[in-house]
Interface confidence: low
């Protein structure tokens, strides 16, 4: 899915008001500096095809994101917010249900969840221009 | 813990330039921001630029433009502030600052110990 | 640019006294940052985003405001909040206040 579209300010906006809070409240008990950021983007539409493959593309250690709170306000932020985004993600959603597992908050998760704040940051803030 | 500790006092001539280091630690260096921020004796702080660690792209206050340089070494985890043409004016205490993504908004939430820059002939 | 004016620049009270400082945008911002800063030393954080208080303020502090009026209010004020207040702006550059003094009378 191309996010080049989206609407990034009412985007950002869910993030502020409540998708922030349940990344969270999901690492809550971890040290912020336990983990360190290994994965970035380069501007809007990157950081959100990044946070869409972490949030919603199972990886070996982590197979359980899509379900939390954070997961499901993301999706429909996207869903609202980013043009056609919806009809790309029926297949998708379809396999997941197939697939679901039992809820676990590995060790694995907590980083990818780290990895996903680190993320949402970029997204809030655009970087700066070379000059 | 986070740290920024910053180089020793300077003293000046005026026309001259002076580039003030500032060493991070306890984080990601190119996860944050970096402000510069002086403060002449008895006045108020004034802001003069910010850098991003991880692009290297920076935005001045437009009263130090063409005057003011920063920039990063990533792999000293350190930044840098040049001032050229110094004039007595430019006689003040100058800090770094982090400048960290709260969830509500953008502030300086850890600041260097400040280096004194003085110009005088 | 946008402009912001503390007032008063010097707050005049004793101990146990209500303290209000304010801080006007010469444009509306998103947030305002407080700083508390005493003599010798490096600004501290103070609250955040308007209204967060920073690791370590006391509860006795809080802050409030939107648009283009923003107040940091101390309810009982205490020996060790007498120092210097600025308060600033991100939304565009990063400007600061002129400041506002708490001293003891």
């Known amino acids: 899915y191309d996010f080049t579209n989206c609407d990034f300010e009412k985007i950002k906006a869910a993030y502020l008001s409540t998708i922030s809070k349940d990344l969270i409240t999901y690492m809550s008990g971890t040290k912020s500096t336990e983990f360190n950021n290994t994965v970035s983007c380069s501007n809007r539409p990157h950081c959100l095809t990044e946070i869409q493959s972490l949030t919603f593309n199972p990886t070996a250690g982590c197979a359980s994101l899509a379900k939390e709170m954070f997961a499901m306000k993301t999706k429909a932020a996207l869903a609202i917010w980013c043009p056609g985004y919806s009809e790309t993600q029926i297949n998708a959603t379809q396999a997941m249900k197939k697939r679901r597992k039992r809820k676990v908050t590995t060790n694995k998760c907590l980083e990818q969840v780290s990895q996903l704040q680190g993320l949402w940051r970029r997204f809030n803030r655009p970087l700066l221009k070379q000059q | 813990e986070v740290q920024l500790v910053q180089s020793g006092a300077e003293v000046k001539k005026p026309g001259a330039s002076v580039k003030v280091s500032c060493k991070a630690s306890?984080?990601?260096?190119?996860?944050?921001?970096m402000n510069w921020v002086r403060q002449a004796p008895g006045q108020r702080l004034e802001w003069m630029g910010i850098?991003?660690?991880?692009?290297?792209?920076?935005s001045y206050n437009q009263k130090f433009k063409g005057r003011v340089t920063l920039t990063v070494d990533k792999s000293a985890s350190t930044a840098y502030m040049e001032l050229s043409s110094l004039r007595s004016e430019d006689t003040a205490v100058y800090y770094c600052?982090?400048?960290?993504?709260?969830?509500?908004?953008?502030?300086?939430?850890?600041w260097g110990q400040g280096t004194t820059v003085t110009v005088s002939s | 640019e946008i402009v912001l004016t503390q007032s008063p620049a010097t707050l005049s009270l004793s101990p146990g006294e209500r303290a209000t400082l304010s801080c006007r945008a010469s444009?509306?911002?998103?947030?305002m940052h407080w700083y508390q800063q005493k003599p010798g030393q490096a600004p501290r954080p103070w609250i955040y985003?308007?209204?967060n208080l920073a690791s370590g303020v006391p509860a006795r502090f809080s802050g409030s405001g939107s648009g283009t009026s923003y107040t940091l209010t101390i309810s009982r004020l205490e020996p060790e909040d007498f120092a210097v207040y600025y308060c600033?702006?991100?939304?565009?550059?990063?400007?600061f206040g002129g400041g506002t003094k708490v001293e003891i009378k």
């Open positions: 600033q702006q991100s939304d565009s550059g990063r400007e």
């Open positions: 850098i991003s660690p991880y692009n290297g792209g920076t």
């Open positions: 444009s509306s911002v998103s947030y």
């Open positions: 600052a982090r400048e960290d993504y709260d969830y509500d908004g953008y502030a300086m939430d850890y």
């Open positions: 985003a308007t209204s």
């Open positions: 306890g984080y990601t260096f190119t996860d944050d921001y």
